[in-house]
């Protein structure tokens, strides 16, 4: 009874197409597959950034796989051939592992790379990234930003830099068509006559860094002798109403402070007949139904009513 063996895949490699972190893992079928012509061979692929504790595992019949990585670190991957039990009249047979690594060889000490990189997608419309120069770099150092997301043919360079003292310290992006709900890759590299500058890589999804505009058209409506309804409208722009959470701050007679978080554009407040003044502000944020994270908007303009009995009429600024 001869033991069934299978070779590992050939020519296993990680290919960098220049997409700033989106890499191709590819391989060729193992040698001597002739014995298993009637059989669909599968491959188990494991990969991770070096330093990560966990491997991502994929089982596929294909000869390639694509995923995003952090190019600030190296990447390691391994793959072996799987013969399903149907092919071997028994248990599954696995080859030995084929292994490969990939990294972008760094230039420059880490302190030279950009510091405090911050990207905000304003109102789900305008992306702006800003950074501080690396520590100890001279004024001749300049940084350049490149970006890519699925849908672009190749990585693009920023064309509208924000500058301070002649140095690029930020980028205003153009309209980014069909760019949300997918990984957005950025590389900021640099050059200097004085010393090599370390590149930095960043990956995020645009819907998770949205800072909306504040809500507008704040109003009061008396619902009953002891209830007032606060209302507002969603800010102008592309973000649908179902995507908002709101935080309200309410002051009664300059003393009581109420804060609340709500999911729609109204809030009912219990009041007393003695209330002489009522003010509130609202801010908005993209909620968990539309993103995994977000940034609170600025507070709205304050809406107040004072000087008349609040029970007498509808209050509208």
């Amino acid at each position: 009874d001869t033991e069934i063996k299978v070779n590992p895949p050939q020519d296993f490699e990680i290919v960098d197409p220049g997409y700033l972190g989106y890499l191709y893992l590819q391989w060729q079928p193992p040698l001597s597959l002739d014995h298993f012509k009637e059989c669909t061979v599968e491959y188990e692929l494991k990969y991770r950034n070096i330093g990560s504790e966990t491997w991502k595992t994929i089982i596929t019949k294909n000869l390639h796989y694509k995923d995003g990585f952090d190019l600030n670190k190296g990447i390691e991957a391994k793959i072996h051939t799987l013969l399903p039990w149907q092919c071997t009249n028994g248990s599954e047979v696995q080859s030995s592992w084929a292994e490969t690594t990939y990294w972008i060889s760094p230039q420059g000490i880490p302190e030279t790379k950009v510091q405090d990189m911050d990207c905000v997608y304003y109102n789900w419309q305008y992306l702006l990234c800003s950074w501080k120069p690396g520590i100890g770099v001279l004024l001749d150092t300049n940084y350049n930003l490149f970006y890519w997301y699925e849908g672009l043919d190749h990585a693009l360079q920023c064309v509208d830099y924000i500058k301070a003292d002649g140095q690029n310290i930020g980028c205003r992006f153009p309209y980014l068509e069909a760019s949300d709900y997918k990984d957005f890759y950025i590389c900021v590299n640099g050059s200097s006559e004085n010393k090599p500058i370390r590149s930095s890589y960043f990956t995020f999804q645009l819907q998770n860094i949205v800072k909306p505009l504040p809500p507008v058209y704040l109003t009061f409506t008396r619902e009953s002798s002891c209830e007032i309804k606060l209302k507002w409208s969603i800010p102008l722009g592309p973000i649908p109403a179902r995507c908002f959470d709101y935080e309200i701050e309410i002051r009664e007679d300059d003393t009581t402070l109420v804060t609340a978080t709500v999911e729609n554009e109204t809030y009912t407040l219990k009041t007393t007949n003695e209330t002489r003044q009522l003010c509130f502000v609202v801010r908005s944020k993209v909620n968990i139904y539309c993103s995994d994270d977000g940034i609170w908007s600025e507070w709205s303009d304050k809406q107040c009513w004072e000087g008349e009995d609040l029970s007498k009429k509808t209050l509208l600024r």
Epitope: S105, P106, G108, I109, P110, P196
Partner: antibody, heavy 116, light 108 residues
Framework: QVQLQESGPGLVKPETSLSITCTVS????????VHWVRLSPGKGLEWLGV???????DYNAAFISRVNISKDNSKNQVFFKMNSLQANDTAVYYC??????????WGQGTTVTVSS | EIVLTQSPSILSASVGEDVTITCTAS???????LHWYQQKPGSAPKLWIY???NLASGVPSRFSGSGSGTSFTLTISSLQAEDAATYYC?????????FGAGTKLEIK
């Protein structure tokens, strides 16, 4: 497997210069940076500088005026030169491979004694 | 420059004991840039722990590393005779790259 081997003169006279060659095997210096570090009884481990895979260099500011690092990619060799040696430059000089913001493999070191 | 102060400078302990070496930085070091090396007499330093807490290939699991900011530690649980060596912490964050003065670990 990865190996780095330093070769130096052993004994050098004060006020002269020191040249050490680091010959590497098992990896290409076009893909990895190479650091130079020394170990002396008085000062412990001191980083002297690095030549990156692209050929650019970074030096310890304390040595920048008298250290030069260069390389020959075709021979997979890195060269370290230090001028104006004094007795307190007596040390074991190491080359080490840069990987993942560490020095993951080191040569065995070459002992340099500065004495007349 | 970032000065790394190791303590103690010499540590004498018995086989089976737990030992801790500390490394204090004069200014904050990002944890991914703080490493430990082991050096035995007549040999080159070996990368031992990288990025504060990751063991280099072949390092026994009785070693561990932790810390953040300016305070980092290397711990050996149940010391073995072959652990006798000098241990150096190292920061790769800012130029010049610097090392601690070393902790010489002796077996009683």
């Amino acid at each position: 497997q990865v190996q780095l081997q330093e070769s130096g003169p052993g004994l050098v006279k004060p006020e002269t210069s020191l040249s050490i060659t680091c010959t590497v095997s098992g990896f290409s210096i076009t893909k990895y940076g190479v650091h130079w570090v020394r170990l002396s009884p008085g000062k412990g481990l001191e980083w002297l500088g690095v030549i990156w895979s692209g050929g650019s260099t970074d030096y310890n500011a304390a040595f920048i005026s008298r250290v030069n690092i260069s390389k020959d990619n075709s021979k997979n060799q890195v060269f370290f030169k230090m001028n104006s040696l004094q007795a307190n430059d007596t040390a074991v000089y190491y080359c080490a491979r840069d990987f993942g913001d560490t020095m993951d493999y080191w040569g065995q070191g070459t002992t340099v004694t500065v004495s007349s | 420059e970032i000065v790394l102060t190791q303590s103690p400078s010499i540590l004498s302990a018995s086989v089976g004991e737990d030992v801790t070496i500390t490394c204090t930085a004069s200014s904050s070091v990002t944890s991914s840039y703080l490493h430990w090396y082991q050096q035995k007499p007549g040999s080159a330093p070996k990368l031992w722990i990288y990025s504060t807490s990751n063991l280099a290939s072949g390092v026994p699991s009785r070693f561990s590393g932790s810390g953040s900011g300016t305070s980092f530690t290397l711990t050996i649980s149940s010391l073995q005779a072959e652990d006798a060596a000098t241990y150096y912490c190292h920061q790769y964050h800012r130029s010049p790259l610097t090392f601690g003065a070393g902790t010489k670990l002796e077996i009683k």
